[in-house]
Interface confidence: medium
């Protein structure tokens, strides 16, 4: 049975806490950190940073599950991205989607007022 | 004086409603509409669809302001994207950003439970 993605994300948050000391054991490493809170625009950089971190982290044990989960999350996001242009629909459907996007942007994005 | 982006987005939402009839006058046009509600992953496709719509819409009058605003929003998003990899910081700052991203994903994204 496939684990729901919402569960994977919640588990990953817990694992991140658990492995914080291990993940920060290399104090000299520098990773890309966006300068704003619109995380959704920076997914590429987040996973690029994770690849660097993975390669620099002592492997084995339960930290492997953390990296496996992060890999599942990336796979899920890539799958969602593929669905972006999958369907061609009437203009009114497109406008509904645009309206929703702007609504989300208006209420949930970190923008200067 | 530069208009805050939050104001531009709110205005654009109003203009979209106002010009709905004009924008949907071409019944044969088909545009890319994502099959999920994680709009933030589909920004490329949204603005690609807008380019098609712009080229197919009778220009002039107040609809011009709508397209100008949508162009400003695209410019803002592109600017935000550029800031994604602008800074290189300590692992702990990167982990905080990752933690926040997963937190947002967990609470705000449309995922199967």
């Amino acid at each position: 049975m496939e684990i729901p993605m919402s569960t994977v994300v919640k588990e990953t948050l817990i694992q991140l806490s658990t492995h914080r000391a291990l993940l920060t054991s290399n104090e000299t490493m520098r990773l890309p950190v966006p300068t704003h809170k619109n995380h959704q625009l920076c997914i590429g950089e987040i996973f690029q940073g994770l690849d660097i971190l993975k390669n620099q982290t002592v492997r084995g044990g339960t930290v492997e599950i953390l990296f496996q989960n992060l890999s599942l999350i990336k796979k899920y996001i890539d799958g969602q991205k593929e669905k972006c242009g999958e369907e061609r629909r009437k203009t009114r459907h497109f406008l509904d989607y645009l309206q929703e996007f702007l609504g989300v942007m208006s209420t949930e994005w970190a923008m200067e007022v | 004086m530069e208009i805050p982006m939050s104001t531009v987005v709110k205005e654009t939402l109003i203009q979209l409603s106002t010009h709905r009839a004009l924008l949907t006058s071409n019944e044969t046009m088909r545009l890319p509409v994502p099959t999920h509600k994680n709009h933030q992953l589909c920004i490329g496709e949204i603005f690609q669809g807008l380019d098609i719509l712009k080229n197919q819409t009778v220009r002039g009058g107040t609809v011009e302001i709508l397209f100008q605003n949508l162009s400003l929003i695209k410019k803002y998003i592109d600017g935000q994207k550029e800031k994604c990899g602008e800074e290189r910081r300590k692992t702990r700052h990167f982990l905080d950003y990752l933690q926040e991203f997963l937190g947002v994903m967990s609470t705000e994204w449309a995922m199967e439970v």
């Epitope: 806490s17 658990t18 000391a21 291990l22 054991s25 | 700052h93």
Partner: antibody
């Protein structure tokens, strides 16, 4: 519950060394950094440094580098702060504090250890 | 080192008063700021982290705001148990540095 219990008060002579302990319980010791902070009588707080119990990596405030040594004993879940070449201005209460797993703030503090340096 | 300048150094207030304490960093600290409360003879206690995030169990009358270099701690309605010294702490860069403290006394 999560607790940090520190060793008792110490009186030392100038030039001597002191080693303060901080015993952790109620959580996985290697998962959280331990910070050390001191407070001279009637003064504010001053950060000495931190140690990552996972790999014994420590980071010091330059002011204490060479005089402060942070160590851990994983088998007893205990962190130690040793301060050498003591002088009267080192008279202070020394606190250990745990970094919370997310976002680095100090979520649990020890009760403090008073170190008095006097001839 | 990053300097943290807190003001005022002390203030007198009455129960029910709204109290504001400010903290200025000598450089941008990316919201890596916490507010710490200390009562006489007791260990410090963290109230707020990341500039505005209230820690579980801390009363909602405490709130934090600010980003970059300027930060504020507000107690909306001062209670008898709030009379203490408050410190800001930056943990954006090493060495972590504290403000000099603000003593909140009973008027």
């Amino acid at each position: 519950q999560v607790q940090l219990v520190q060793s008792g008060a110490e009186v030392k002579k100038p030039g001597a060394s002191v080693k303060v302990s901080c015993k952790a319980s109620g959580y996985t010791f290697t998962n959280h950094h331990i910070n050390w902070v001191r407070q001279a009588p009637g003064q504010g707080l001053e950060w000495i440094g931190y140690i990552n119990p996972y790999n014994d990596y420590s980071r010091y405030n330059q002011k204490f580098k060479g005089r402060a040594t942070l160590t851990v004993d994983k088998s007893t879940s205990t962190a130690y702060m040793e301060l050498s070449s003591l002088r009267s201005e080192d008279t202070a209460v020394y606190y250990c504090a745990r970094d919370y797993g997310n976002f680095w703030y100090f979520d649990v503090w020890g009760q403090g250890t008073l170190v008095t340096v006097s001839s | 080192d990053i300097q943290m300048t807190q003001s005022p150094s002390s203030l007198s207030a009455s129960v029910g008063d709204r109290v504001t304490i400010t903290c200025k960093a000598s450089q941008d600290i990316n919201s890596y700021l916490s507010w710490i409360q200390q009562k006489p003879g007791k260990a410090p206690k963290t109230l707020i982290h990341r500039a505005d995030r209230l820690i579980d169990g801390v009363p909602s009358r405490f709130s934090g705001s600010g980003s970059g270099q300027d930060f504020t701690l507000t107690i909306s309605s001062l209670q008898p148990e709030d009379f203490a010294t408050y410190y800001c702490l930056q943990y954006d860069d090493f060495p972590y540095t504290f403000g000099q403290g603000t003593k909140v006394e009973i008027k």
